[in-house]
């Protein structure tokens, strides 16, 4: 039968290239069965992950999976870095892989990428 353990579906070494000044939503895909777990986001600082206490978060429920969202309103240059979501479930702590945000301020970038370029050449943003 299907496992009822909580699972967090952030892919290993996942990355997002984003622009300072824009709104952005960082999603933590959460799979659970009966009771929705308590989920938090933290930002990696060396070997420790600092809990993001005062940040706006929300849940988005879909048919087979839920998303715990960290809102960037808007993205700031110092949001650059790696993030991890964690779930408390039946006294167990489940941690996701880290996901990295590469933040570029286009005013300091060598060129301003178009929407199409961002889709096809994300490396433009953090070279």
């Amino acid at each position: 039968k299907e496992s009822c353990d909580v699972q967090l579906y952030i892919k290993r070494q996942s990355e997002h290239s984003i622009l300072a000044g824009d709104p952005f939503e960082l999603e933590c895909p959460v799979k659970y069965c009966a009771n929705r777990p308590h989920v938090t986001w933290c930002k990696l600082n060396g070997t420790t992950c600092v809990k993001l206490e005062d940040r706006q978060t929300s849940w988005k429920e879909e048919k087979n999976i839920s998303f715990f969202i960290l809102h960037f309103e808007p993205v700031l240059p110092n949001d650059n870095g790696s993030y991890r979501c964690s779930a408390n479930f039946q006294s167990n702590l489940i941690e996701s892989h880290s996901t990295t945000l590469y933040v570029t301020d286009v005013k300091s970038a060598s060129e301003r990428p178009s929407k199409d370029e961002m889709a096809s050449r994300p490396w433009l943003l953090y070279r």
């Epitope: 622009l19 300072a20 000044g21 824009d22 709104p23 309103e73 808007p74 700031l76 240059p77 110092n78 301020d105 286009v106 005013k107 300091s108 301003r112 990428p113 178009s114 929407k115 199409d116 370029e117 961002m118 943003l125």
Partner: antibody, heavy 119, light 107 residues
Framework: QITLKESGPTLVKPTQTLTLTCTFS??????????VGWIRQPPGKALEWLAQ???????RYSPSLKSRLTITKDTSKNQVVLTMTNMDPVDTATYYC???????????WGQGTLVTVSS | DIQMTQSPSSVSASVGDRVTITCRAS??????LAWYQQKPGKAPKLLIY???GLQSGVPSRFSGSGSGTDFTLTISSLQPEDFATYYC?????????FGPGTKVDIK
């Protein structure tokens, strides 16, 4: 060079809906980091940020006015439209269209259009 | 919302004077602050971004400093064209908010 120009009615009656159009040139709203927004200024008073639309299509509104505001873009026409419902005399102000690139500092402004709300 | 306050609300000064305007945020905004100049009947003009960055084309007599909650705009030697109203604006979080303005007029 970048220019923005506001157009719309100069006089609206209370309870009516205001529709303002910002027509711009010198940039594209599909370029990374660009945003076009609206800021207003009642006569003799301070500036108030109303709404902004981003190159991604994301929209953000002033929480105090969110229920009355809608911002849309027509990238092919280089236009951004703001609608504001249920106008009241306190909404009398000069309405400015703005451009931002990257962080949300408004580096280009339209000349502004004065909208008076009166019966 | 982040509230922005400015002081003084008005200042009378002479050509050549050094003028300092302060802006305070109700919570920390790092250095995500801009300063604008507005003349009667005209749109505001961006002077300073990111607390201390001088916008292209703005004379070097304008400078900005500060971070966190307290910020300063300084005009090192006031020129006749500088008589105007100055506004600060935080870009740290939605909704973006402006200070009430500081009017610089002729003494």
């Amino acid at each position: 060079q970048i220019t923005l120009k506001e157009s719309g009615p100069t006089l609206v009656k209370p309870t009516q809906t205001l529709t303002l159009t910002c027509t711009f040139s010198g940039f594209s709203l599909s370029t990374g980091g660009v945003g076009v927004g609206w800021i207003r200024q009642p006569p003799g008073k301070a500036l108030e940020w109303l709404a902004q639309i981003f190159w991604t299509g994301d929209k953000r509104y002033s929480p105090s006015l969110k229920s009355r505001l809608t911002i849309t873009k027509d990238t092919s026409k280089n236009q951004v439209v703001l609608t504001m419902t249920n106008m009241d005399p306190v909404d009398t102000a000069t309405y400015y269209c703005t451009h931002k690139l990257g962080m949300n500092y408004f580096d280009y402004w339209g000349q502004g259009t004065l909208v008076t709300v009166s019966s | 919302d982040i509230q922005m306050t400015q002081s003084p609300s008005s200042v009378s000064a002479s050509v050549g004077d050094r003028v300092t305007i302060t802006c305070r945020a109700s919570q920390g905004i790092s250095s995500w602050l801009a300063w604008y100049q507005q003349k009667p009947g005209k749109a505001p003009k961006l002077l300073i971004y990111a607390a201390s960055g001088l916008q292209s084309g703005v004379p070097s007599r304008f400078s900005g400093s500060g971070s966190g909650t307290d910020f300063t705009l300084t005009i090192s030697s006031l020129q006749p064209e500088d008589f105007a109203t100055y506004y600060c604006q935080q870009a740290n979080s939605f909704p973006f908010t402006f200070g009430p303005g500081t009017k610089v007029d002729i003494k």
